[in-house]
């Protein structure tokens, strides 16, 4: 029986009965938050062989092993993951071993086994036989291996039953528990699975099979399952579903959801039955279950019941995420906020059409309206009193409407009104009249030339850069000395710079009036010598990174014909020089024969240029005699067990430290202080743990149903 779509077992261990007839769980399996220690021995689910998404275990008291619960779990497909993981075992206080002795394949995703204070038999499992890549596995804060004394079957009797593999240069026996070996297939099978008797399965099988070379005898399928057979692709008139089986059109049309209406049901696209059309596609009509490509961004019509949507916070803007057409009126009233410009762009940046009017008032946090970066049409079907469809009143810091060189905006009906916007130049408003096609509609009082732009540098001269010099982490720039009509009015210059991978930034990107600004700012005093050109050294930059830079002159608010003169440069794009890359990541080596080593690594996190090649160096090392000092198989040599607390363990030094010459004297050596890089890595590690734990809690703690 296929169970799904995802099973959540919590609070009451008897809910496990829901798994009784499941052979495949189509979706995830959560077993969590069972705080009363129970006896799980009577619960056994031998039918369960496959979980198509992920397995999550969290705070289940009394459960000591998973082997009895799921003796035949063979494959976790990881079609959808829990924070990049297909297997999560977290804060399982009594778990002593994983024990999933039939688990042969985790198709996608990594594993996270963390804060399980009593959990052993972790170092005896070779995860590389189960997962494609082990570098993303996260196994920390469990019982320290030296307190576990993990013994594979037969080692005590000196008749080892398990096979050996090499992990991190350690060639050892591989097992799940004290009496269950980790199954390995003969090398003759290659990537294929095998039966219990080591006969190779059909290539379409995954994990295991009940008979060799038979595509109907697979425990799980490598690709897709259809009508009892494992197939490489779904046959005609069937569609891939949940990454593992083939279904027909009726099946797909009959998947229900409590969250969406039947007209928003599953669709068929590109040979797959899926929940909704993928990005860039839209349903081919309201009663269709097929998708067609969108022309431009996919339309999403949003409607405000009360006709006018007030945007006075990020929360209210959030309701418009993804909307391309807004049926109604927008009233923007943003007085304060943190990082407001980029937040508004995130939630309102896709709006292309507003059917009613747009009113921006008392929005002192706004410097620009560029967060409405796709707005191209205001229909003005509903207008404010006085027939206004674009109304801008009392915005103390508004400096820019849009970048009119890259913006087409049409106001189909209605007039514009601007008043009491002291930093908004009238020239900017006149430019909007031309672009939007409203020139001639406004009467004289609609654009107030006295109280718009009264505190802005509206007549700007252009500053020209004269030289630029770069190194790997520095840029030196100079520019022409600006000479206003009265030299005393020039106070200083401000240099603005930021990383700019693409040459598409504008002065107002990410800027608001509450201190958020995506630009770094440096003040530059005037050189005392009037003949020296002003300049700056920008340092602490990243190698091989493109930066955008512009300069503004800071002038006295000297009024000339009712306007303040100012000066600024165009935006200059400049790249720092290349540098030495950081070290390659996740270096792994393994021997696959007596004369070969296979070395794998990931690219450096900071290439600092275009990587052209890697240099691999190796040297022969003498064998470490220390490895042979103890007989690790004898019980009396195993250190006394002490209960781990489930926190992250720092490896203890159990031997006397080596004595070396330190600080000019002989004596025991102190641990070297941590480098900045190590401290940073530890900080990031701790942060990553917190992020995961937050994600876990946010995902699984839900309000009780009423």
């Amino acid at each position: 029986e296929i169970c799904g779509p995802g099973i959540d077992i919590r609070n009451d261990y008897q809910q496990l009965k829901r798994l009784e007839n499941c052979t495949v769980i189509e979706g995830y399996l959560h077993i969590l938050l069972i705080s009363k220690a129970e006896d799980y021995r009577s619960y056994r689910f031998p039918k369960l062989t496959v979980i198509t998404e992920y397995l999550l275990l969290f705070r289940v008291a009394g459960l000591e092993s998973l082997g009895d619960l799921f003796p035949n779990l063979t494959v976790i497909r990881g079609w959808k993951l829990f924070y990049n993981y297909a297997l999560v075992i977290f804060e399982m206080t009594n778990l002593k071993d994983i024990g999933l002795y039939n688990l042969r394949n985790i198709t996608r995703g990594a594993i996270r086994i963390e804060k399980n204070a009593d959990l052993c038999y972790l170092s005896t499992v070779d995860w590389s036989l189960i997962l494609d890549a082990v570098s993303n596995n996260y196994i920390v804060g469990n019982k320290p291996p030296k307190e576990c004394g993990d013994l594979c079957p037969g080692t005590m009797e000196e008749k080892p039953m398990c096979e050996k593999t090499t992990i991190n240069n350690e060639y050892n026996y591989r097992c799940w528990t004290t009496n269950r070996c980790q199954k390995m297939c003969p090398s003759t099978c290659g990537k294929r699975a095998c039966t219990e008797n080591n006969e190779c399965c059909h290539p379409e099988c995954l994990g295991s099979c009940s008979a060799p070379d038979n595509d109907t005898a697979c425990v799980a399928c490598r690709h897709y399952y259809y009508a009892g057979v494992c197939v490489p692709a779904c046959p005609p008139n069937t569609y891939r579903f949940e990454g593992w089986r083939c279904v027909d059109r009726d099946f797909c049309a009959n998947i229900l959801s409590a969250e969406s209406s039947d007209s928003e049901g599953f669709v068929i696209h590109d040979g797959e039955c899926m929940q909704e059309c993928p990005s860039g596609f839209i349903r081919n009509g309201s009663q269709s279950m097929y998708c067609i490509p969108c022309e431009g961004p996919c339309p999403k019509v949003c409607e405000e019941e009360k006709k006018t949507k007030t945007i006075d916070s990020v929360t209210s803007a959030q309701m418009l995420q993804g909307c391309t057409i807004f049926k109604g009126n927008l009233l923007i009233n943003i007085r304060r906020g943190n990082n407001i410009a980029s937040e508004l762009e995130n939630f309102m940046g896709l709006i292309e059409v507003v059917t009613g009017y747009v009113k921006i008032r008392h929005s002192h946090a706004l410097v620009s309206l560029s967060f409405l970066k796709n707005l191209r049409l205001i229909l003005g079907e509903e207008q404010l009193e006085g027939n206004y469809s674009f109304y801008v009143l009392d915005n103390q810091n508004l400096q820019q409407l849009w970048d009119w060189d890259h913006r087409n905006l049409t106001i189909k009906a209605g007039k514009m009104y601007f008043a009491f916007n002291p930093k908004l130049c009238v020239s900017e408003i006149y430019r909007m009249e031309e672009v939007t096609g409203t020139k001639g509609r406004q009467s004289k009082g609609d654009i107030n030339t006295r109280n718009n732009g009264e505190r802005a540098s509206c007549e700007s001269d252009v500053l020209h850069f004269t030289s630029t010099t770069t190194s790997k982490n520095r840029i030196i720039i100079t520019w022409h000395r600006y000479r206003p009509p009265d030299y005393r009015d020039l106070i200083s210059f401000t240099v603005y710079y930021k990383e700019a991978p693409f040459k598409n930034v504008t002065e107002y990107d990410g800027q608001d009036a509450c201190g958020s600004n995506s630009w770094n700012m440096v003040d530059v005093d005037l050189p005392p010598n009037k003949d020296v050109e002003p300049g700056i050294l920008l340092h602490g930059l990243k190698p091989w990174t493109q930066y955008a830079v512009y300069v503004k002159a800071v002038t006295l608010t000297m009024v000339e014909n009712d306007h303040i003169r100012g000066a600024k440069s165009e935006i200059l794009y400049i790249r720092t020089n290349a540098s030495v890359p950081s070290i390659p990541l996740d270096v792994l080596s393994a021997s696959n024969s007596s004369s070969q080593l296979i070395v794998k690594w990931n690219p450096p996190s900071l290439p600092n240029g275009n990587l052209s090649y890697y240099i691999v160096r190796w040297q022969r090392q003498p064998q470490d005699g220390y490895l042979y000092r103890h007989n690790y198989c004898s019980k009396d040599k195993i250190p006394i067990r002490k209960y781990a607390d489930g926190t992250i363990d720092i490896e203890e030094v159990t031997e006397n430290p080596k004595t070396e010459v330190c600080g000019g004297e002989k004596g025991p050596c102190c641990a070297c202080p941590k480098t900045e890089a190590e401290k940073q890595a530890e900080k990031e590690e701790a942060e990553y743990r917190k992020v995961f734990e937050n994600f876990l809690h946010n995902s699984i703690f839900v309000p009780r149903p009423e």
Epitope: P5, D250, A253, I255, L256, A258, D262
Partner: antibody, heavy 118, light 107 residues
Framework: EVQLVQSGGGLVKPGGSLRLSCAAS????????MHWVRQAPGKGLEWISV???????YYADSVKGRFTISRDNAKNSLYLQMNSLRAEDTAVYYC????????????WGQGTTVTVSS | EIVLTQSPGTLSVSPGERATLSCRAS??????LHWYQQKPGQAPRLLIK???QSLSGIPDRFSGSGSGTDFTLTISRLEPEDFAVYYC?????????FGQGTKVEIK
């Protein structure tokens, strides 16, 4: 011929249990969501439950926690397990294959009577 | 849940006349509304699906219209066999719901 044949109705005491069955034929049973609808004597139709093709189940508030819908695709059968029965559960119960939003015709079982009385 | 309200509760019409039945949803359900006819002792029979889609085998005197919250079933010329109870049913959102029914009787 597409048809649904029901069985399992009868007289039961309040607090008792009953299991209704619905055998499907003439179509690919596993490819359709299946519903249960009931009609109390002299009253209108009341939708009570559905199980979709993935096995996801949904219930009306009036039966939630007491009734369980299930299916066995291998046997082409739909079931309704009714526990903690009350007098107000007395009705004719129909199994129903609703023509989905896009395709498929509407099919009803013949109905089976459940009487809850002491 | 979405509440469907049918009106009138009872409609008295003479054979050959036109009958108009109304169904109103408590919130928008798009076109996910179906009309059923039920005669005593029988299972319901689907007449119109998705507000206006006619079905093969159903006489073309039955027609449906509407979308969103207001829907209408029209029987253009009542035949003797049309006197029955008519139900609307929404499948837009779970739980599905039925209207309370409209009884069409001979005047």
């Amino acid at each position: 011929e597409v048809q649904l044949v029901q069985s399992g109705g009868g007289l039961v005491k309040p607090g008792g249990s009953l299991r209704l069955s619905c055998a499907a034929s003439g179509f690919t049973f596993s490819s359709f969501a299946m519903h249960w609808v009931r009609q109390a004597p002299g009253k209108g139709l009341e939708w009570i439950s559905v199980i979709d093709t993935r096995g996801a189940t949904y219930y009306a508030d009036s039966v939630k926690g007491r009734f369980t819908i299930s299916r066995d695709n291998a046997k082409n059968s739909l079931y309704l397990q009714m526990n903690s029965l009350r007098a107000e559960d007395t009705a004719v119960y129909y199994c129903h294959r609703l023509g989905n939003f896009y395709y498929g015709m509407d099919v009803w079982g013949q109905g089976t009577t459940v009487t809850v009385s002491s | 849940e979405i509440v469907l309200t049918q009106s009138p509760g009872t409609l008295s019409v003479s054979p050959g006349e036109r009958a108009t039945l109304s169904c109103r949803a408590s919130q928008s359900i798009g076109s996910s509304l179906h009309w059923y006819q039920q005669k005593p002792g029988q299972a319901p029979r689907l007449l119109i699906k998705h507000a206006s889609q006619s079905l093969s085998g159903i006489p073309d005197r039955f027609s449906g219209s509407g979308s969103g919250t207001d829907f209408t079933l029209t029987i253009s010329r009542l035949e003797p066999e049309d006197f029955a109870v008519y139900y609307c049913h929404q499948s837009s959102r779970l739980p599905h719901t039925f209207g309370q029914g409209t009884k069409v009787e001979i005047k």
